[in-house]
Structure formats: C-alpha cells, structure tokens
C-alpha cells in the first residue's frame, strides 16, 4: 500500500520546551514531501506544514489551544510531483507519533535569576517568570500562570569560599534566604514540577554571585 517511491516517516519525536512544541522525524526527503496532521483524541485532524521538505513541524499554535489535552500527530509522505506521473497505490504512507500531553511533558526551560537584593542577613532572590506561547484573552501567559502551584523553584546556594550547598524551595518566584553578613554567596535555581513522572526538573539556571556582575561568575 502507499504511493510508489515514497517511504514512511520514522523516529517521530516531540521536542517541547515551555510549550514551544516541534515534531521531528526522519528521513530527509528524497523525491517526496511531507504533510503533518495533529488531533486531540476526540477532535478532527488538522493539516500543518503542508507539502513540506522539512523534517520538523512547529505545532505550538495547535497545542497551546489546550495544553492539558493529549495530542497525536501523524506524518504523511507524498511523492514529489502529481500522482499520475509518479504512480499511485492508493492512500499515502503515514506514521503516527507517540501521544503527547503538553502540560505533563513539555520540558521546563532553563530559569533565569532576575535579581537578588541583600538586606542585612537576608537575601531576596527573584526568578524570572518566563513567558510562554500559551494565550488567554489575547495575552501570553507566564509559566506560573499556566502551572500555578504545580510549579516550584529550588534554589541552591553556597558561600563563595566553600562548596557545601544549601537549598531553599518556593511555590512563588521569590526566595528569602538567610546569609551571614559580609559573606559573598553564589546561587542557581531550578524549576521543578514534583507531581510529574517525566521531565520533572529544568536545567540549572546560570550561577549568580553576590558582589559580581550578573553572568560573570567563573567557577
């Protein structure tokens, strides 16, 4: 079955960070093009990346409509030209993707420490509330808007002169940590969704140190 001289896509893989979601597949096309369809379990199929010679398709616009839905995509292979000239054996070849639930599976992007301010023996550390591509009422929602209290941040901090790390957790985007007066500290943050079974943690934010320009810390 399928169309002569076409091969089915394989290795269909979801790549998603902070809901920016791209479907990737193989092989690079030779004498064929691809069209992607996406659907929820209960919905209709919608075509995207029509007759593309790429091996990836940005499906963000579709999945952000409801990030808690489960999506399935499929990639069709069509011959590079009309079927009358290339020969046809009925319906085109296609391959299904794994199911993908953005809310449960999108990778958490690397956080950024937005600011830190020391007052006496307290330091207030603020993690940037990153904007996502999820919209509500025509505005883009932040990561906190989407995940609410499901999202926590862990802060790892230590005296610049030692290697022993302490941790703090928050279900907002701010930490208030105790420090010794006159001592320089370094810290990095990590986004975590404890309720998840996969992709629970983000990569670490860049390390920031008190008394240095942001981003200039060298280990």
């Amino acid at each position: 079955s399928g169309t002569t001289n076409t091969v089915a896509a394989y290795n269909l893989t979801w790549k998603s960070t902070n809901f920016k979601t791209i479907l990737e597949w193989e092989p690079k096309p030779v004498n064929q093009v691809y069209t992607v369809q996406i659907s929820t379990k209960s919905g209709d199929w919608k075509s995207k990346c029509f007759y593309t010679t790429d091996t990836e398709c940005d499906l963000t616009d579709e999945i952000v409509k409801d990030v808690k839905q489960t999506y399935l995509a499929r990639v069709f292979s069509y011959p590079a030209g009309n079927v009358e000239s290339t020969g046809s054996a009925g319906e085109p070849l296609y391959e299904n993707s794994p199911e993908f639930t953005p809310y449960l599976e999108t990778n958490l992007g690397q956080p950024t420490i937005q600011s830190f301010e020391q007052v006496g023996t307290k330091v207030n550390v603020t993690v940037e509330d990153e904007r996502t591509l999820v919209r509500r009422n025509n505005t883009f929602l932040s990561l906190r808007d989407v995940f609410g209290k499901d999202l926590i941040y862990t802060l790892y901090y230590w005296k610049s002169s030692s290697s022993g790390k302490k941790t703090a957790k928050t279900n907002t985007n701010e930490f208030l940590i105790d420090v010794e007066k006159g001592v320089s500290y370094c810290f990095f943050a990590q986004a975590v969704i404890p309720s998840r079974t996969v992709n629970r943690k983000s990569t670490d934010s860049p390390v920031e140190c008190m008394g240095q320009e942001k981003g200039e810390f060298r280990e």
């Epitope: 029509f50 319906e91 085109p92």
Partner: antibody, heavy 119, light 113 residues
C-alpha cells in the same frame, strides 16, 4: 482535453453561505491535488485552499480558515468549496486549479465563478 | 509567510522590444537539496484565467513561445519577453510554491507603447 468548470457563484448577503463546485474532466482527477484561488475585482491573485489527491489533507489561507471548507468527491470528479460566514472582502472570482508538474504549480485553471457578497 | 514583490506595477514597451519584469521574495525559494527555485510565472489576459508560463524559475511550460524566459535564484527573479508581440498584452504574476501559504506577486501590467 483537460477541463475545469466552476459553478455555484452568485450574490449573497454577508454572514450567509455558498457552495462552489468544480467539475473536472479529461484527466484522472483522483491523481491530482486541487486548489481554489480567488481574484477580487481589479486585484491580484490570492491562494485560498488546497486538498491533496486523496482528500485526506487540506490547508487554508488564514483569511478563510475556519469559515471555508475544501472537499472533493473523486467518484464524481468534483471539487467543492463550502463558504460560510461570508464577508464583503470575500467578493471575488473563484478559480479552481490543478496541481501541475509540482505541488502548487497550476497547469490548468477553470474559467472562474463570481461570488459577490453584498447586503 | 513569503511575501512576493513585483516591479514595476506597469510597463509600456514598443512592439518588438524587450520587456523585463522583476520579482523579489521575502525569503529564499531555493531548495538546496535539489537546487531548484520554487517560483512560477503566469500570464493573465482580461476576462481569462491565468496561464502558466514558467516554473522552477526558468523552465518554460510546453507550448509557451521561446520569447518568454525566466531567470534568477534565491530571492530575485526576472521574467523577460525578448520581443514583445501584441498578444503579450496582459498582467503577469510571479508565485512561490516553496511553502504554504502559496503567495503571488501583485502583478505587472504590460502594455504597448
């Protein structure tokens, strides 16, 4: 010889619906992707929608997405365009066109059917 | 979306003279793996549908007179009518078929001077 004949155009009020048809003959209809292209009076060409030879995949211009539906009946050698929630800016001559040597290269066009959306 | 920009909007040329129409795409329509430019040219006479002249930027459709030629690559393309005939009076459109949505240039009206 290849022939594409559109029908179904006419005058319609804003918000109403219309269905265009394109009857194909002289070629193996089921083997070709088909498109709708429109041309507003005195203006240029605007691609509207495409459907693959098998009818499985369809794609639309942003300007008509969610309002227009392209479909085909390969047993009847006919292409359709269901147009809902019509607007004044949809007023145009609507052409059906056949994919030629490659997808999106139109080697044959119909003569067009005029759709006028006016109250 | 790829934006196609044609120039000039209109062109008056004497019979037997050369007519040159330019088309610029907002991004490349060259597909590197087959080295083809996904660009076509159409001719439209009053009251008629468009007619395919050129595809792959420079390949003439069968039956098209050889006075019509296409050239260019990447983002800049040209349609040339080497010796204008009376029957060539029409509007000419470029179109990219590299990626969807398919887009056309605004058209160039060719008249006789």
């Amino acid at each position: 010889q290849v022939q594409l004949v559109e029908s179904g155009g006419g005058v319609v009020q804003p918000g109403r619906s219309l269905r265009l048809s394109c009857a194909a003959s002289g070629f193996t209809f089921r083997s070709y992707g088909m498109h709708w292209v429109r041309q507003a009076p005195g203006k240029g060409l605007e691609w509207v929608a495409v459907i693959t030879y098998d009818g499985i995949n369809k794609y639309y211009a942003d300007s008509v997405e969610g309002r227009f539906t392209i479909s085909r009946d390969n047993s009847k050698n006919t292409l359709y365009l269901q147009m809902n929630s019509l607007r004044a800016e949809d007023t145009a001559v609507y052409y059906c066109a056949r994919d030629g040597v490659y997808y999106g290269v139109y080697d044959y066009w119909g003569q067009g059917t005029l759709v006028t959306v006016s109250s | 979306d790829i934006v196609m920009t044609q120039s000039p909007d209109s062109l008056a040329v004497s019979l037997g003279e050369r007519a040159t129409i330019n088309c610029k795409s907002s991004q490349s329509v060259l597909f590197s793996s087959n080295n083809k430019n996904y660009l076509a040219w159409y001719q439209q006479k009053p009251g008629q549908p468009p007619k395919l002249l050129i595809y792959w930027a420079s390949t003439r459709e069968s039956g098209v007179p050889d006075r019509f030629s296409g050239s260019g690559s990447g983002t800049d393309f040209t349609l040339t009518i080497s010796s204008l005939q009376a029957e060539d009076v029409a509007v000419y459109y470029c179109q990219q078929f590299h990626s969807y949505p398919l887009t056309f240039g605004g058209g160039t009206k060719v008249e006789i001077k």
